[in-house]
Interface confidence: medium
């Protein structure tokens, strides 16, 4: 999910963050504690075990969607909730897991053969009816690889890593999701105690690529717990 | 096609409030982040101020910030730019932009001049 | 804030030449980097993004390349059309900052 700070995945070996970001949530996260707000030296996660609050589904992870947590619940108070399983109810796409959509209010396969023609229709409706790609191919395309061959490159839009192409995961920048290379050793990563600690962040970093892990550098283990650096390290 | 049209552009004196509007048309408007980005006379462009497509996340330039404030209706498909507390400095012309991807502003609009004078 | 700085601020060139234009970011934003093209009294236009990728319609004669701190936009054979000011512009980070514009005039 929003697992990283405000760092490139090109920026090796320097703790975040270069600047920040003067984001002003509205009050549905502004509400919540211990959120990360972008801007200050300082990075506190969320409680370990405190809902990650949302107000799109772009903020939450690609198994997730933004909703309230209670039935017909006050839509002021949204957190990320586990995407829904096939056969599942749901309301729109993003409420399916990946590799599923939201047909007649049922989470269903995308393999399905007359998937193509109504995920065509809605994210040609999602992103609007024109050429709203920068890639000079239909946003459609990038979005699963099972329907479509054509994989987006660095810096296109995507909805899950399975939509980049190889060497690249999709990860949040700003108000987006695009396709960002997936970080090599040495460079800075981010390492969360568990699924759902995220912080309120601006840039998403991609996982450390094969063979390599997540772990705190070796000259940092004396820092404090917050300021601790973690790197892409071989296993 | 996609349309953007800024309008609510005049003169204004110092400390004076201004708001201006951008009527988008030809694609789902509440599916993308916009921005507002001027130019001043004869000078190069600054980025001021962006907002989410639900409009739940708004960021400022430093130079406005506390001063303008960016909002938008997705029923009505409108960007908005309310300017308070306005200063010579801030005569230029004003465009709205649509983002694409991460700030990439991908369509423009044709700009409307504000100008901050006694 | 990051720091865009183009050079030159303006060049003059004949139909048919190369052109390189370059940006320059004070700290390093990756592949960040866009860069547009604006004539007098129009808005701008996107003409590449993420350092390199070329925006449907843009023609093949415009090209980018870079990543880090060092940017160039390089047109490779100049059309009357692409007398103009182009902009560089870092989206690494809020604020989001372009570089002081190059004209590129007729030589």
């Known amino acids: 999910t929003l697992n990283s700070v405000l760092n490139s995945n090109a920026i090796k070996n320097l703790p975040p963050p270069l600047g920040g970001a003067a984001g002003h949530p509205g009050s549905a996260v502004s509400a919540a504690p211990g959120i990360l707000y972008p801007g200050g030296n300082k990075y506190q996660t969320i409680d370990n075990y405190q809902p990650y609050p949302c107000a799109e589904d772009e903020e939450c992870g690609t198994d997730e969607y933004c909703a309230s947590p209670t039935r017909g619940g006050d839509a002021g108070v949204q957190i990320c909730l586990a995407c829904r399983k096939r056969r599942k109810r749901c309301m729109r796409h993003a409420m399916c897991c990946p590799g599923n959509y939201c047909k007649n209010g049922i989470c269903v396969s995308s393999d399905q053969n007359h998937f193509r023609g109504e995920i065509e229709e809605t994210i040609t409706e999602s992103f609007g009816n024109d050429h709203s790609t920068l890639d000079g191919y239909s946003r459609r395309t990038t979005l699963s690889s099972k329907m479509y061959h054509t994989k987006g490159q660095e810096g296109s839009v995507c909805l899950r890593s399975s939509d980049c192409a190889s060497g690249l995961c999709c990860a949040r920048h700003f108000w987006s999701k695009i396709c960002k290379p997936v970080l090599k050793e040495g460079q800075v990563c981010t390492k969360h105690r568990r699924k759902g600690s995220h912080g309120l962040e601006i840039f998403q970093r991609c996982y450390c690529g094969e063979g390599l892990s997540c772990r705190i550098q070796k000259d940092h283990h004396q820092a404090s717990n917050s300021s601790r650096l973690h790197t892409c390290q071989r296993h | 096609e996609v349309q953007l049209l800024e309008s609510g552009g005049g003169l204004v004196q110092p400390g004076g409030s201004l708001r201006l509007s951008c009527a988008a048309s030809g694609f789902t408007f509440s599916r993308f982040a916009m921005s507002w980005v001027r130019q001043a006379p004869g000078k190069g462009l600054e980025w001021v101020s962006a907002i989410s497509g639900s409009g739940a996340y708004t960021y400022y330039a430093d130079s406005v910030k506390g001063r303008f404030t960016i909002s938008r209706d997705n029923s009505k498909n409108t960007l908005y730019l309310q300017m308070n507390s306005l200063r010579a400095e801030d005569t230029a012309v004003y465009y709205c932009?649509?983002?694409?991807?991460?700030?990439?502003?991908?369509?423009w609009g044709q700009g409307t001049l504000v100008t901050v004078s006694s | 804030d990051i720091q865009m700085t183009q050079s030159p601020s303006s060049l003059s060139a004949s139909v048919g030449d190369r052109v390189t234009i370059t940006c320059r970011a004070s700290h390093s934003i990756s592949s960040y980097l866009n860069w547009y093209q604006q004539k007098p009294g129009k808005a701008p236009k996107l003409l590449i993004y993420t350092a390199s990728r070329l925006r449907s319609g843009v023609p093949s004669r415009f090209s980018g390349s870079g990543s880090g701190t060092d940017f160039t936009l390089t047109i490779s054979s100049l059309q009357p059309e692409d007398f103009a000011t182009y902009y560089c512009?870092?989206?690494?980070?809020?604020?989001?900052?372009f570089g002081g514009g190059t004209k590129v005039e007729i030589k």
């Open positions: 932009a649509r983002d694409i991807a991460a700030a990439s502003f991908d369509y």
């Open positions: 512009q870092q989206n690494y980070n809020t604020p989001f900052t």
